[in-house]
Interface confidence: low
């Protein structure tokens, strides 16, 4: 908390400019009018304030808007957003996509912070729905955001959003989510050639049906065991030994190490022993 002191003569700020970086914290508190700050928030980011000085500016805005900042101020917060707590953000009513983008840009390159999670929650609730533009924006900044959505919410995700997704962003998705995402990925990547297509679709294959796995087995994709182990059991069971051998290529030897785990275990039990023996891995059905 900054002590209330009178502003020294001649130091009253008439506008938010670079001269303020030389003000001590108490001088900022005393000499910068909160209403002036609110109307010139867009200038703050161009000025190299210290974190301590930013704390003072935040304090002034908090006093001016105890019920929460208006969107006109929020949109221009810039780096001051990093000073906000989830509690601060819960008071906001953010409805403009431009505001959301501006604040996500500030946090870009970092993990989704509690502040950002709260901001997104406030924005989506304010809009009343997860529309295409919102999803496009969120997945552009946080592709991992997809896995935090329910299958019902995911059904409205446009295939174009899938382009920004990286394999690690699907790590937290469960099979029900992948069931919804896989057809979208298939559509998004449909014009790519075989090997490039497999590189892109690989992360989504936990939602692939049997017929698509059969088709992939004809394309020399050499699926690794980690991917195979994430496939739907019901999709793997109808595959023949020959199809699995083609699907895995040189990785087929890895089946031995996974023979007690699903889906390999269940698949082995469905095969004729004669067919399993052709693999030469000692798998017992």
């Amino acid at each position: 908390e900054v002590e209330k002191t009178a502003c020294p003569s001649g130091k009253k700020a008439r506008e938010i400019d670079e001269s303020l970086i030389f003000y001590k914290k108490w001088e900022l508190e005393a000499c910068v009018d909160a209403a002036l700050l609110a109307t010139q928030m867009d200038r703050v980011n161009a000025i190299p304030f210290t974190y301590e000085q930013l704390d003072v500016l935040k304090h002034k805005l908090d006093e001016l808007y105890p019920q929460g900042y208006p969107e006109s101020v929020i949109q221009h917060l810039g780096y001051l957003f990093l000073k906000m707590s989830p509690e601060d953000i819960r008071k906001w009513n953010v409805t403009s996509l431009e505001t959301l983008k501006a604040l996500l840009e500030v946090n870009k390159g970092h993990e989704m912070s509690p502040q950002v999670a709260t901001l997104i929650d406030r924005f989506v609730k304010g809009r009343g729905q997860l529309d295409k533009d919102t999803l496009d924006t969120l997945t552009a900044f946080y592709p991992g955001y997809l896995c935090s959505l329910s299958p019902e919410e995911l059904s409205s995700v446009p295939p174009s959003s899938i382009w920004a997704v990286r394999p690690q962003d699907l790590d937290t998705c469960d099979p029900r989510q992948l069931d919804v995402l896989y057809p979208k990925a298939r559509l998004a990547f449909q014009n790519m050639n075989g090997s490039e297509y497999f590189v892109k679709i690989q992360s989504f294959l936990g939602g692939a049906p049997t017929e698509d796995l059969k088709a992939l087995s004809q394309q020399n994709v050499s699926m690794d065991l980690a991917t195979f182990m994430k496939l739907r059991t019901d999709a793997v069971l109808p595959l023949t030994v020959a199809e699995v051998q083609k699907l895995l290529g040189p990785h087929v030897e890895g089946l031995k190490a996974e023979e007690r785990h699903r889906p390999v275990r269940d698949w082995i039990l469905r095969q004729r022993q004669d067919d399993l023996d052709t693999l030469g891995l000692g798998l017992q059905g």
């Epitope: 983008k101 924006t137 552009a140 295939p159 174009s160 382009w163 990547f189 014009n191 490039e196």
Partner: nanobody, 127 residues
Framework: QVHLVESGGGSVQAGGSLRLSCAAS????????MGWFRQGPGEEREGLAQ???????KYADSVKGRFTISKDNAKNILYLQMNSLKPEDTGLYIC?????????????????????RGQGTQVTVSS
């Protein structure tokens, strides 16, 4: 497949401006992202700018503040507004529709994963 055709190149004095256009047609025009890269005399490729269909733009340090990428989604035309041109900006400017929107990959090699690309439009900046 996506078909890309660039236009707007030409010769200009240092400090001048040019606006390049890239008309896109085909069945995947509205998805993913699009970008511009420059091919120099020695065939070296330099990723310059990229824009996602949600209009988030990225720029290489060498052109930041001078070049602006934009896209008219209704007409499927990609633009590159180039101001304060320098002699080192000379090259063949090529429009591409990367199959992967990774900016870092685009900077390393604009043709990673062999995306659709145009034939290019030549820009010559003289001092």
């Amino acid at each position: 497949q996506v078909h890309l055709v660039e236009s707007g190149g030409g010769s200009v004095q240092a400090g001048g401006s040019l606006r390049l256009s890239c008309a896109a047609s085909g069945d995947r025009v509205s998805t993913g992202c699009m970008g511009w890269f420059r091919q120099g005399p020695g065939e070296e490729r330099e990723g310059l700018a990229q824009i996602h269909n949600y209009n988030i733009a990225k720029y290489a340090d060498s052109v930041k503040g001078r070049f602006t990428i934009s896209k008219d989604n209704a007409k499927n035309i990609l633009y590159l507004q180039m101001n304060s041109l320098k002699p080192e900006d000379t090259g063949l400017y090529i429009c591409t529709a990367p199959v992967d929107c990774s900016w870092s990959m685009f900077l390393q090699d604009p043709l990673a994963l062999s995306p659709p690309r145009g034939q290019g439009t030549q820009v010559t900046v003289s001092s």
